[in-house]
């Protein structure tokens, strides 16, 4: 059963249908919508059988409609249900207001029902002109927009319409007058020089596209000088003006073809700067110093002429940078009067010339630089100099190899000698001397000096080593030492040290009576006025005592036997054999043998007698240890 058809309006351009029907009964529904006065053809819609409501959009506003519906079940149509309803009235815009007015733009605000319009159509028309209107559209969601690009102080009529697909509201209008173009603020001249000035002005930020500056010489029909500068500037340097000249400067702002009322200021450039206060002073006997005053940053350069007063033909010209206010002029003659002139140049223009006269000083003299009393660390200097001129003397001491820092002394101008100390020994120096008086430095004179070597103690040598001693020798500077101390200590430090004091002229010491075959340390120190040098050291081992050994008895006979032994080669001068019967019944027999012998046949002894035999070697007069043996002669 299909029933309960209700129709309600959905806005001004649509209707909503609701109905009831048995669930899952219908394949689909057929809906017919027709204007009540049947002006236009009916609209048919087919909707699925599951629906129980549908919106019908796109209808005419404020129009009565007849709506019919039937269902289809297995090809069978149900009876038709019908109902009548009218669409609503079209919505109107609310009010339109101008929220903000500037001189070149305004802000438009309006009210409208939400979601009613696709867009708004706005028309901006200058009042009382036939000029084409400005048209713009804005989205239907907006309720405000800016209208830029307007003319200042101009009447405008602004209309707005809301627009849908097939409908436009009645327009709303508003009239408005844009404001005047803002005026410039203050124009001031903040800096004035002889050839330039600086303008400063105030304006609202971001207002002007550009400014036009006009610079005109007052009381002149000469063409004005125009400058256009960006609207962001508030200051401008105007160069290239004439000195001491009145100028009228005007400024106006420009914005989209509009010009402000001009601002004007009058100003007089300063007079051309002049040079002043030329002073000339002597700088030694061969130079002059010039000082002058001048305006800062004014001059390209200065031209100076220096001329001997009595020699007109030989002038010296110098061109100097415009930043200078002083210069030294060297290379002049001593005790000579000079005329000095100077002028400045400013963009090709010459200032008046300033002149002054001055004389160079008499040439002072220094000479005869002499070096004396040279020691390992010092020397004395003496020199000659013109009296009463010098305030100080400067002495520079430079080592010839340039390995040391230069030492500089400044001493009184009354001195003619100096003691230079604290120098390293055995070093070549160049001494430079110059004299200084007010504004004067003489030519430098020089001399050379070499500091003496420090006294030397070196080359400790040990020679002539033997079992009982050795010779100590060394080298030392002549006349450097009052005495030498030689100390001899055994390496094991078991014995007392032996000390030998020698005169400062001695260079060697022979040591005897030492122990054979042990180590010794030898130290040699020099003394000067009781001050001891660090010792030279050497270590040495005395030779071992030569040995006689292995005394053997063989080949016994009734009156003797053969003796043989061993001994160090090349050490002994000779050997001594002592033979005596053990009962001491006969005189002892003593035999001296030459060094190369190592055997001896002994005869003339008693038969069957026991003998005690002793053997020792002799080397350089000293006896070796004795070796002994017992031998018995054979029975007869």
């Amino acid at each position: 059963e299909l029933e309960n058809l209700t129709v309600t309006e959905v806005g001004w351009d649509g209707l909503r249908l609701n109905w009831t029907a048995a669930d899952q009964a219908y394949e689909h529904f057929i809906i017919q919508v027709q204007e009540a006065n049947k002006v236009e053809a009916a609209r048919n819609l087919t909707v699925p059988g599951s629906l129980r409501a549908v919106d019908i959009p796109g209808l005419k506003a404020a129009t009565p409609y007849t709506v019919s519906i039937y269902g289809v079940i297995q090809g069978y149509r149900t009876p038709v249900l019908s109902a009548e309803a009218s669409t609503g009235e079209t919505p109107n815009l609310g009010e339109v207001v101008v929220a903000e007015v500037g001189w070149d733009a305004l802000k438009l605000n309006w009210t409208a029902p939400e979601g009613a319009y696709e867009y708004f159509f706005i028309q901006v028309q200058e009042a009382d002109t036939v000029e084409a209107a400005q048209n713009l559209t804005v989205p239907g969601g907006l309720r405000s927009t800016d209208l830029p690009g307007l003319k200042a102080a101009t009447h405008y009529t602004i209309t707005i319409r809301g627009v849908t697909q097939d409908f436009s509201t009645t327009p709303l209008s508003v009239e408005v007058l844009t404001e005047e173009v803002p005026d410039m603020g203050n124009l001031t001249v903040t800096e004035v020089s002889w050839d330039a000035l600086r303008l400063n002005w105030t304006t609202p930020d971001g207002t002007y596209d550009q400014f036009t500056i006009q610079v005109q010489e007052a009381d002149q029909v000469e063409e004005a000088h125009n400058l256009t500068v960006p609207g962001s500037l508030r200051s401008m340097e105007i160069p290239g003006l004439r000195a001491g000249t009145p100028y009228t400067v005007t400024l106006h702002g420009e914005v989209r073809g509009h010009s402000t009322r001009p601002l004007a200021v009058e100003v007089v450039t300063e007079d051309l700067p002049q040079l002043g206060d030329l002073a000339v002073s002597e700088v030694g006997w061969d130079g002059l110093r010039l000082n002058w005053t001048a305006a800062d940053n004014a001059y390209e350069h200065f031209v100076i002429q220096v001329q001997e007063v009595n020699k007109v033909e030989a002038a010296q010209n110098l061109t100097l940078p415009g930043s200078l206010r002083a210069v030294d002029i060297p290379g002049l003659e001593a005790a000579t009067p000079y005329r000095v002139s100077i002028y400045g140049v400013i963009r090709g223009y010459r200032t008046p010339v300033l002149s002054a006269e001055a004389s160079t000083a008499k040439e002072p003299e220094i000479g005869n630089l002499n070096v004396s009393d040279i020691t390992p660390e010092s020397f004395n200097l003496s020199w000659m100099a013109t009296d009463g001129i010098f305030e100080t003397f400067t002495i520079e001491i430079i080592d010839s190899n340039r390995l040391l820092e230069t030492v500089e002394y400044n001493i009184s101008g009354a001195e003619r000698t100096a003691h230079i100390s604290g120098l390293p020994p055995s070093t070549d120096f160049i001494v430079y001397l110059s004299g200084l008086a007010p504004s004067i430095r003489t030519k430098t004179i020089s001399a050379t000096a070499t500091t003496e070597a420090l006294p030397l103690l070196e080359n400790l040598t040990i020679s002539d080593i033997n079992p009982y001693g050795f010779t100590v020798s060394w080298m030392a500077s002549e006349n450097a030492f009052d005495s030498f101390l030689v100390t001899v200590v055994d390496s094991g430090k078991l014995l007392d040290p032996q000390e030998f004091t020698l005169s400062g002229t001695q260079r060697k010491l022979e040591l005897r009576g030492l122990i054979t075959g042990i180590g010794y340390e030898v130290m040699v120190s020099g003394f000067t006025q009781g001050h001891q040098t660090k010792p030279l050291r050497a270590e040495i081992v005395t030779e071992a005592e030569p040995e006689v050994d292995n005394l053997l008895v063989s080949d016994a006979t009734p009156d003797g036997f053969r003796l043989s032994w061993t001994a160090d080669e090349g050490v002994f001068d000779n050997f001594v054999l002592k033979i005596r019967d053990t009962k001491k019944q006969s005189e002892p027999l003593e035999i001296t043998l030459l060094a190369p012998e190592r055997t001896r046949d002994i005869t003339g002894l008693r038969e069957a007698t026991e003998y005690e035999i002793e053997l020792y070697g002799i080397s350089k007069g000293r006896r070796s240890q004795t070796v002994s043996a017992i031998a018995t002669t054979a029975m007869g």
């Epitope: 020691t375 390992p376 660390e377 010092s378 003496e452 420090l454 006294p455 030397l456 103690l457 500077s477 006349n479 450097a480 030492f481 009052d482 005495s483 101390l485 004091t501 003394f527 000067t528 006025q529 009781g530 001050h531 001891q532 040098t533 660090k534």
Partner: antibody, heavy 118, light 107 residues
Framework: EVQLLESGGGLVQPGGSLRLSCAAS????????MGWVRQAPGKGLEWVSA????????YYADSVKGRFTISRDNSKNTLYLQMNSLRAEDTAVYYC???????????WGQGTLVTVSS | SELTQDPAVSVALGQTVRITCQGD??????ASWYQQKPGQAPVLVIY???NRPSGIPDRFSGSSSGNTASLTITGAQAEDEADYYC???????????FGGGTKLTVL
């Protein structure tokens, strides 16, 4: 006990002369080298001169060379320093000192003040 | 001066202090060291390699390396506050030279 006693100091004008003496006792004077060391007011020590045991060798600092003379009389156990052409910079306490052969100055006197001023 | 010393050095009571002396002549000669208290004559405290005259406490010692000599006081006492001068030979022409002196303060 070793004693060294200086005398002869005093005030003298620049260019003037003074003779300092040092009387020694308590050691073998003739076996010791002797010397003079000075100390300007508020300054450090400065060696001036020295003489060997018998007096045959003398030594001088550059600053006094040619103006000062050291000498000794071993019979009187006395050391002398003759100072000529005195300058303001010679103003100092002058100490007499002894040293044995293998030692530096090991005993000093108490000093005598020399003032050179106009 | 041919022998160079630091003008002033300080040490806490009982601590160790080292006073140095530099000069070319110290490459060859040992330095000697003198102590001088205000208004008094100098006193020899160290000579040679490291020798002390009789009466000098063993807290004083000397050493030498290259062109530098050192005086070390181990466990400085209040009575050690004084000026200390190093001294050496400079060869035959100028046989004796002194350093400029070091003022030792014991805190």
């Amino acid at each position: 006990e070793v004693q060294l006693l200086e005398s002869g100091g005093g005030l003298v004008q620049p260019g003037g002369s003074l003779r300092l003496s040092c009387a020694a006792s308590g050691f073998t004077f003739s076996g010791s080298r002797m010397g003079w060391v000075r100390q300007a007011p508020g300054k450090g020590l400065e060696w001036v001169s020295a003489i060997n045991e018998e007096g045959g060798q003398t030594y001088y600092a550059d600053s006094v060379k040619g103006r000062f003379t050291i000498s000794r009389d071993n019979s009187k156990n006395t050391l002398y320093l003759q100072m000529n052409s005195l300058r303001a910079e010679d103003t100092a306490v002058y100490y007499c000192a002894k040293h044995p052969p293998h030692r530096p100055f090991d005993y000093w006197g108490q000093g005598t003040l020399v003032t050179v001023s106009s | 001066s041919e022998l160079t010393q630091d003008p002033a050095v300080s040490v806490a009571l009982g601590q160790t202090v080292r006073i140095t002396c530099q000069g070319d002549s110290l490459r060859l000669y040992y330095a000697s060291w003198y102590q001088q208290k205000p208004g008094q004559a100098p006193v020899l405290v160290i000579y040679g390699k490291n020798n002390r005259p009789s009466g000098i406490p063993d807290r004083f010692s000397g050493s030498s390396s290259g062109n530098t000599a050192s005086l070390t006081i181990t466990g400085a006492q209040a009575e050690d506050e004084a000026d200390y001068y190093c001294n050496s030979s400079h060869g035959p022409r100028r046989p004796v030279v002194f350093g400029g002196g070091t003022k030792l303060t014991v805190l």
